[in-house]
Every structure is written in structure tokens, then in C-alpha cells.
């Protein structure tokens, strides 16, 4: 029995749970998902039982062995997978555990602007980047382009301080998860701050 293997998949994609067996005389192999039997194989008996009909189209054995490939992944396929190799030549079954995380492909992140002030010709505000559907394990970074050096900022909130008369800047939020990344629409500092330009001490949401 080896250490737990962590696997990552994307919704609609496929993942293979690798299984290399050194057991010579295999009586049966049982794949389990969160304690529910998924597939039972009795190699000598030529028996392959896919327990639930809905999985019949999604299960495959890709490498001529006992590795399990699961296709058309859904979010609720995330969980603990377990395989037991049973043999009369073993005192106890050979086992392997896997943890599968299934992630969605990220849509375009949404950007909202916080309270804005314009003091002494400097526009100050926060930009907040978020996913509309509350996707898990998303990491946000900001790219600020346009000044002498392009800058990066980690985190979903970007504090902005831009002086009128400076060259315009473009802000882009990058959202990443283990299977994809996506970009917000670019936001121009000049456009963002135009609303506060008339009143040097204005604040707006």
C-alpha cells in the first residue's frame, strides 16, 4: 500500500487512476468511490462489473492493465477513490488510495470598484476581482501595465493610486485554478477615474 495519490481533473475531462500491480495471481480488483463500489474485476473469470449504469459509459481501462480511467468528469466526482487487489497469494489485500479534485474551467472574472476618492489630482480606489459562481481554489493576481515597469500584485484586491497627467495604466485580473486560467476585461485608469475628475474631493462607489 503506497501513499495517497492526489489527482486533479477538470469538468468534462478525464482522469486516470494509475495502478501498477506486482501481484501474480489476482483474484479480484475492486475500485471504490467514497465507500461505494465502482468497478469489480475478476481477471480470470473475465468478469467486469461496473456497479452503476450511469458510470458504464465513463469507465475504461486504458493501459491493458487494471488502471481506471474516468471520463466526462463532474464536480461531484471529487472525493476519495480506493482500490483493493485481492489474491489468495496475499495475506491481506494490496491497496491504494487516491484523492480526486475536479475543478471547473474558469469563466471570465468580474471586477468591482470600491469607494473612490480624488484628492490633489490623485485618484485612489480598490479594484476587487471575483468569480461570479464562487469557484473553489481560485488564485488571483493583478497585472498593471503601462508605466515604465509592468507590475504584478497577488490577491483579489488591487489598491490603485493614479495621478492625473501620468501615462494611462491598464489593470487586468488573472484568475487561476489547477486546471485553467482566465482574464478580466482590461480596465483603464483614466476611464476608472473620470467619474471623480470634476470634484477634486469626491468619493463614489
Amino acid at each position: 500500500s503506497g501513499p495517497v495519490k492526489e489527482l486533479v481533473g477538470s469538468v468534462g475531462g478525464a482522469v486516470t487512476f494509475p495502478l501498477k500491480s506486482k501481484v501474480k495471481q489476482v483474484d479480484s480488483i475492486v475500485w471504490t468511490f467514497n465507500t461505494t463500489p465502482l468497478v469489480t474485476i475478476q481477471p480470470e473469470g473475465g468478469t467486469i462489473i461496473v456497479t452503476q449504469n450511469r458510470n458504464r459509459e465513463r469507465v475504461d481501462f486504458p493501459d491493458g492493465g487494471y488502471s481506471l480511467k474516468l471520463s466526462k468528469l463532474k464536480k461531484n466526482d471529487s472525493g476519495i477513490y480506493y482500490v483493493g487487489i485481492y489474491s489468495s497469494s496475499l495475506q491481506q489485500p494490496s491497496t491504494q488510495e487516491y484523492v480526486l479534485h475536479v475543478y471547473e474551467h474558469l469563466s471570465k472574472p468580474k471586477v468591482t470598484m470600491g469607494l473612490q476618492s480624488n484628492k490633489n489630482g490623485t485618484c485612489v480606489t480598490n479594484l476587487t476581482c471575483c468569480m461570479e459562481h464562487g469557484e473553489e481554489d481560485v488564485i488571483y493576481t493583478w497585472k498593471a501595465l503601462g508605466q515604465a515597469a509592468n507590475e504584478s500584485h497577488n490577491g483579489s484586491i488591487l489598491p490603485i493610486s493614479w495621478r492625473w497627467g501620468e501615462s494611462d495604466m491598464t489593470f487586468i485580473c488573472v484568475a487561476r485554478n489547477p486546471v485553467s486560467r482566465n482574464f478580466s476585461s482590461p480596465i483603464l485608469a483614466r476611464k476608472l477615474c473620470e467619474g471623480a475628475a470634476d470634484d477634486p474631493d469626491s468619493s463614489m462607489v
Partner: antibody, heavy 114, light 107 residues
Amino acid sequence: VKESEGGLFKPTDTLTLTCTVSGFSLNSYGVIWVRQAPGNGLEYIGIIGSSGNTYYASWAKSRSTITRNTRLNTVTLKMTSLTAADTATYFCARYYGDSGFDSWGPGTLVTVSS
Amino acid sequence: AQVLTQTPSSTSVAVGGTVTIKCQASQSIGSWLSWYQQKPGQPPKLLIYGASNLASGVPSRFKGGRSGTEYSLTISGVQREDAATYYCLGASPNGWAFGAGTNVEIK
């Protein structure tokens, strides 16, 4: 791999066929039994694995028994309650794991008739 | 329901031609499928194991393939001695199962 002689049986009789193997150990290879009715296709009956586990086709489960004698290198098929539908040539073959059923006996004809 | 649907049931091919026999499984059976050739009065002979591996001593004109749950046996450059009945044998929920067989006749 060679099957024992078949022959003529009466309905309700019990069939006992022996498959004798040489050149390999039954502790390392499985043996399958297959039959073929005259003019028909091949039909799986059952298999005894290298560790002695037995598996049967659903139709054969209730009246078939496969056993082995590793010392004599023999595998025996016993089938009870014969009917005319059991008239067929019976084959045994070696199961070479992932490499399929690679060595077949010549087959033996079993006729069930009153 | 048939767990291994073999097509066609018979076919005729000229010497030097190509013939493809298909076997459709009712669910995924991975590589647990083999192909056999049987001539009248003889036992079956293993041609392909593990869906695509050529058995020892079998001519290279025999080729096994797989696409999902559909398996195929292709004979290229058919010879007179290839006249026979061909069977697929694969795993299933109920244990080993044979296809119904394909009779190949040489024109």
C-alpha cells in the same frame, strides 16, 4: 492440452470430462471449458483459475462443477441433468493471463440422446 | 442482450483483399478481448490477445484494433488459408463471452 473421450449420454445423465495438461503447472495457468453445438458458435462454460477459483457462465452455474488435481495435472468438468441441447463438441484451453487462451485441446464430441 | 455483438455474420473477400470484422462490447472491457480463428473440425486458434497484440506464430497480416468499446480484426492481403470462422472473446459483467462468429469465404 487434451480432453478425455466424450460419447453418447442419455437425458438426465451426468457428464464428466477430464482435461489433461502437460508442460505447464495448473498453479500458474487457468483452464477454460468451452463447447460448440453442431453448426453453431463457441459457448463459454466456465474456468478454473491458477489459484483454484472457479467462475461459470450464468446458464452453467447451477449444474456445472470444475475441479482440478494439480498433482495429476488434470481439470475435470462435471455437468448434471443433461438434455439434447447439451450435444456439442467440448474443448478445454489454457488461460495464459493477459495473453489469452493460447493452447486448445482437439475437442471431444458429446451426444445426448434417448 | 448480447454482450459482444460481432459483425458481419459472414463475408466474402478476394485473395489479396482486405476484410474487417468488428466486435462491439456493451460496456468498457479495456484490453480483455482476444480473437480466434476456427476451421471445420479443428479447435479455435489464438490470433490476437489484449485487443491488439499478435499471438506467437501468427502472420502479420492479422491486426487487432480498438476504438472505445468497438474492437476490430483486420486481415490485409487475404490468403486462401484464411477461409475460416473468426470469433472474438471478451470479458463481460457475466464472465467470458464469445461473439457469434464471422464466416470468411474466399472468392
